[in-house]
């Protein structure tokens, strides 16, 4: 599948920062999502996890961006082996982990899809 260019990764990082900066109230009313393995293929896995959160405007742009990074169509209820299916975490924690790892990839120039 297509590898996200560095500009697209920068935009994703910026959006993840936008929705977490100085944020103490639970994102998406404290919704829980499946944790994922932060490895190659993580963008599709992240989308598969976050797409199950509906009615949360704060993450809609992130969902759209991840759709652009994922080569196949993802729909609610769809799961890949990249999910750690025994662990659910809050959306805010999920976003923070995703941000941290995306920055790591960006710094090292490894734009994994």
């Amino acid at each position: 599948g297509p590898v996200p260019p560095s500009t697209a990764l920068r935009e994703l990082i910026e959006e993840l920062v936008n929705i977490t900066q100085n944020q103490k109230a639970p994102l998406c009313n404290g919704s829980m999502v499946w944790s994922i393995n932060l490895t190659a293929g993580m963008y599709c896995a992240a989308l598969e996890s976050l797409i199950n959160v509906s009615g949360c405007s704060a993450i809609e742009k992130t969902q759209r961006m991840l759709s652009g990074f994922c080569p196949h169509k993802v729909s609610a209820g769809q799961f890949s082996s990249l999910h750690v299916r025994d662990t659910k975490i809050e959306v805010a924690h999920f976003i923070t982990k995703l941000l941290s790892y995306t920055k790591q990839l960006f710094r090292h120039g490894q734009q994994f899809n």
Epitope: R10, I13, E14, V17, N18, T20, Q21, N22, Q23, K24, A25, L99, K103, F106, R107
Partner: antibody, heavy 126, light 109 residues
């Protein structure tokens, strides 16, 4: 030693321009979000604006009174923050501080740490 | 534009508890930060993210937040705590910072 040192302040006429610099040392400047804060004589602290680290987008935000007149920039290769001030007004007279931005501390490696410069005085008067 | 409201002054006797409040509409969802500024000096962070204390700040300084109000508490105030205190936070977007008007703490010696 962790420190910020401002320079560039001085006396300028209304409508004039000035560029302040803030030299950082002792911490990873490139990872830090940085802010400018000012304090008019005998008044309280006023947030001027901030710049995110490059990795976090490098975007800038400004307070309404300075938006369109002031520009914050950074040069990570020189560990230096800048504040370009144009169309200066008498009400811009203040001590200007540069500081690590606490909102950005969450994303940098200075979480729970606080660094401010000693301040540089800007006087706008005819 | 977004504002944070603080009382202009608070007075306590040495050893008493001083409480300084800060109110703002976005505080239920955004963290508050507290700075101490002594005359002629740069501000010093005493509380971050509502209630966390930076290293080197005495334990008598604590912070809390409930609803639209953040509170800085100095338990057993000392003469050296006399200073101006400012709360700092952001608007609901998180993009724009704001300081409260400041509170002058007087510790009656």
């Amino acid at each position: 030693e962790v420190q910020l040192v401002e320079s560039g302040g001085g006396l300028v006429k209304p409508g004039g321009s000035l560029r302040l610099s803030c030299a950082a040392s002792g911490f990873t400047f490139s990872n830090a979000w940085m802010s400018w804060v000012r304090q008019a004589p005998g008044k309280g602290l006023e947030w001027v604006g901030r710049i995110r680290s490059e990795i976090d987008g490098g975007t800038t935000n400004y307070a309404a009174p300075v938006k369109g007149r002031f520009t914050i920039s950074r040069d990570d290769s020189k560990n230096t923050l800048y504040l370009q001030m144009n169309s200066l007004r008498t009400e811009d007279t203040a001590v200007y501080y540069c500081a690590t931005d606490q909102v950005g501390a969450y994303y940098g490696d200075y979480y729970g740490m606080d660094v401010w410069g000693q301040g540089t005085t800007v006087t706008v008067s005819s | 534009s977004y504002e944070l409201t603080q009382p202009p002054s608070v007075s306590v006797s040495p050893g008493q508890t001083a409480r300084i409040t800060c109110s703002g509409d976005a505080l239920p969802e955004k963290y508050a930060y507290w700075y101490q500024q002594k005359s002629g000096q740069a501000p010093v962070l005493v509380i971050y993210e509502d209630s966390k204390r930076p290293s080197g700040i005495p334990e008598r300084f604590s912070g809390s937040s409930s609803g639209t109000m953040a509170t800085l508490t100095i338990s057993g105030a000392q003469v050296e705590d006399e200073a101006d205190y400012y709360c700092h936070s952001t608007d609901s977007s998180g993009n724009h910072g704001v300081f409260g008007g400041g509170t002058k703490l007087t510790v009656l010696g």
